[in-house]
Interface confidence: low
């Protein structure tokens, strides 16, 4: 039976040009994490290996920085990246937990924050 | 190989502060971030703040906003968390932690009068 919960940075907004983390926590299970996916919508940002350590997808390596801890750093962001992205995590013996947010790349100062953590 | 060592803990009464540090060595990477996690006894370890390494982005729990701030200083391989207005619920072991998984051994924080 899945018991575990993810909890997620939620609905966020970054300026043009800024960088924003991208934090899920997987809790309330004693599953081994296996591995960690991130994707914008269907496209496959990183992946963290529990055994083989991160890879950056190619297309992302000069503007996604691995971390902290299985966290997601995107820089030098532009208003394309606004959109979906997805925390997978794969786990034993539980299964696949999935955890969104929804970022927002804006051109002004203007600051939505998520309910869970908050992204200056 | 990375390590990290935290210090800094120790015992505080409500509403004192406290300056943790974690300072990294034998690191190459120039593009990485730092995140601060606590465990309180009997419970799973928590998110509490992170910071890219150039100091762009950061990130807060909503239980420490406003209360406390992570900050990195390059030049030292170090990051910082302080921590303002602490609360007896802030007592537990924190650890600072990178994106390969290593952690540091930990400092104990105990807020108590």
């Known amino acids: 039976m899945m018991t575990g919960t993810i909890e997620t940075t939620g609905n966020i907004s970054a300026e043009k040009g800024g960088s924003i983390i991208l934090q899920c926590h997987l809790s309330s299970t004693t599953a081994q994490v296996t591995q960690v996916n991130w994707e914008q919508q269907d496209q496959l940002l990183a992946i963290c290996n529990a055994d083989l350590g991160w890879h950056i997808s190619p297309s992302f390596k000069d503007r996604v920085a691995p971390g902290p801890g299985l966290g997601l750093t995107l820089q030098s962001l532009t208003v394309n990246d606004t959109g979906e992205y997805f925390c997978i995590y794969h786990t034993y013996p539980d299964g696949t937990y999935t955890g969104r947010i929804f970022l927002e790349v804006l051109e002004s100062s203007v600051a939505e924050h998520g309910a869970r953590f908050q992204i200056p | 190989e990375v390590q990290l060592v935290e210090s800094g803990g120790g015992l505080v009464q409500p509403g004192g502060s406290l300056r943790l540090s974690c300072a990294a060595s034998?690191?190459?990477?120039?593009?990485?971030?730092m995140g601060w996690f606590r465990q309180a006894p009997g419970k799973e370890r928590e998110f509490v703040a992170a910071?890219?390494?150039?100091?762009?982005?950061?990130a807060y729990a909503d239980s420490v906003k406003g209360r406390f701030t992570i900050s990195a200083d390059n030049s030292k391989n170090t990051a910082y968390l302080q921590m303002n207005s602490l609360k007896p619920e802030d007592t537990a072991v924190y650890y600072c932690?990178?994106?390969?998984?290593?952690w540091g051994q930990g400092t104990l924080v105990t807020v108590s009068s």
């Open positions: 932690g990178d994106y390969e998984g290593h």
């Open positions: 034998g690191r190459t990477e120039a593009n990485y971030a």
């Open positions: 910071i890219s390494w150039d100091g762009g982005a950061t």
